[in-house]
């Protein structure tokens, strides 16, 4: 025997109180699949959340965050405060990155600068709170005879003082 509720489409629920008639979901509720025995209450995008997509009888509302905040979690379940580049969010608010660390985004934590020497490279551009260091060629690449980005300075002849 087929369940009479299986005929109820999305946007309705199977009303046991009314001989399993398919009743439409009331305002502020939805059913996204057929055969449902209840309508789910729509998500409310309040406070720091704002409505990205209105609730309909067949789909839930979707929220995002007001300017100055960004989404965290599945389906934007939380809003977290933005910080500036060069900062990270702590329990006491936005704090500048410590020396030796950087953050090039408005969210997330400060990360250590790349250690160029681990790859046998030299530092080409120093790091800042907002930017990682840029590693250059390895010192070996800069030795005489090796092709290099910047040619070595010409050697002075012995016995000649600079002019």
């Amino acid at each position: 025997l087929q369940d009479p509720c299986s005929n109820c489409p999305a946007g309705t629920f199977c009303d046991n109180n009314r001989n399993q008639i398919c009743s439409p979901c009331p305002p502020n509720s939805f059913s996204s699949a057929g055969g449902q025995r209840t309508c789910d209450i729509c998500r409310q995008c309040k406070g720091v959340f704002r409505t990205r997509k209105e609730c309909s009888s067949t789909s839930n509302a979707e929220c995002d965050c007001t300017p100055g905040f960004h989404c965290l979690g599945a389906g934007c379940s939380m809003c977290e405060q933005d910080c500036k580049q060069g900062q990270e969010l702590t329990k006491k608010g936005c704090k500048d990155c410590c020396f030796g660390t950087f953050n090039d985004q408005k969210r997330g934590i400060c990360r250590p600068w790349t250690n160029c020497s681990l790859d046998g490279k030299s530092v080409l551009v120093n790091g800042t709170k907002e930017r990682d260091v840029v590693c250059g060629p390895s010192p070996a690449d800069l030795s005489p005879g090796a092709s290099s980005v910047t040619p070595p300075a010409p050697a002075r002849e012995p016995g000649h003082s600079p002019q």
């Epitope: 009303d15 046991n16 109180n17 009331p26 209840t38 309508c39 209450i41």
Partner: nanobody, 126 residues
Framework: EVQLVETGGGLIQPGGSLRLSCAAS????????MSWVRQAPGKGLEWVSV???????YYADSVKGRFTISRDNSKNTLYLQMNSLRAEDTAVYYC????????????????????RGQGTTVTVSS
């Protein structure tokens, strides 16, 4: 005995206003989720508006900006103020007590109405 009695219907010209009342007995309106629903001739039930126990109100798109649901706790009465009435608002209007899952003011799911009045007829015609 739990009962709902609607009044205030009638014949009204397009663009006019009406206020429907729903007097409740046997339970407290303010601590329940209450709805107005309507049934146009030859059509199924259509939800019009809902008021939650915390006072939050919600409306069908077809009446948004024209109808207002409210309640008077001292009179244990639910109201529906209907403005800018249109021919398509012609229907029998019922108030109902709704059944929701969830605690307090934060329902999570709706599963039908358990009490409904006998209805009041609204006819919008010139």
């Amino acid at each position: 005995e739990v009962q709902l009695v609607e009044t205030g219907g009638g014949l009204i010209q397009p663009g006019g206003s009406l206020r429907l009342s729903c007097a409740a007995s046997g339970f407290t309106v303010s601590s329940n989720y209450m709805s107005w629903v309507r049934q146009a001739p030859g059509k199924g039930l259509e939800w019009v508006s809902v008021i939650y126990s915390d006072g939050s109100t919600y409306y069908a798109d077809s009446v948004k900006g024209r109808f207002t649901i409210s309640r008077d706790n001292s009179k244990n009465t639910l109201y529906l103020q209907m403005n800018s009435l249109r021919a398509e608002d012609t229907a029998v209007y019922y108030c109902a007590r709704d059944r929701y899952y969830g605690s307090g003011n934060y329902p999570t799911a709706y599963y039908g109405m358990d009490v409904r009045g006998q209805g009041t007829t609204v006819t919008v015609s010139s």
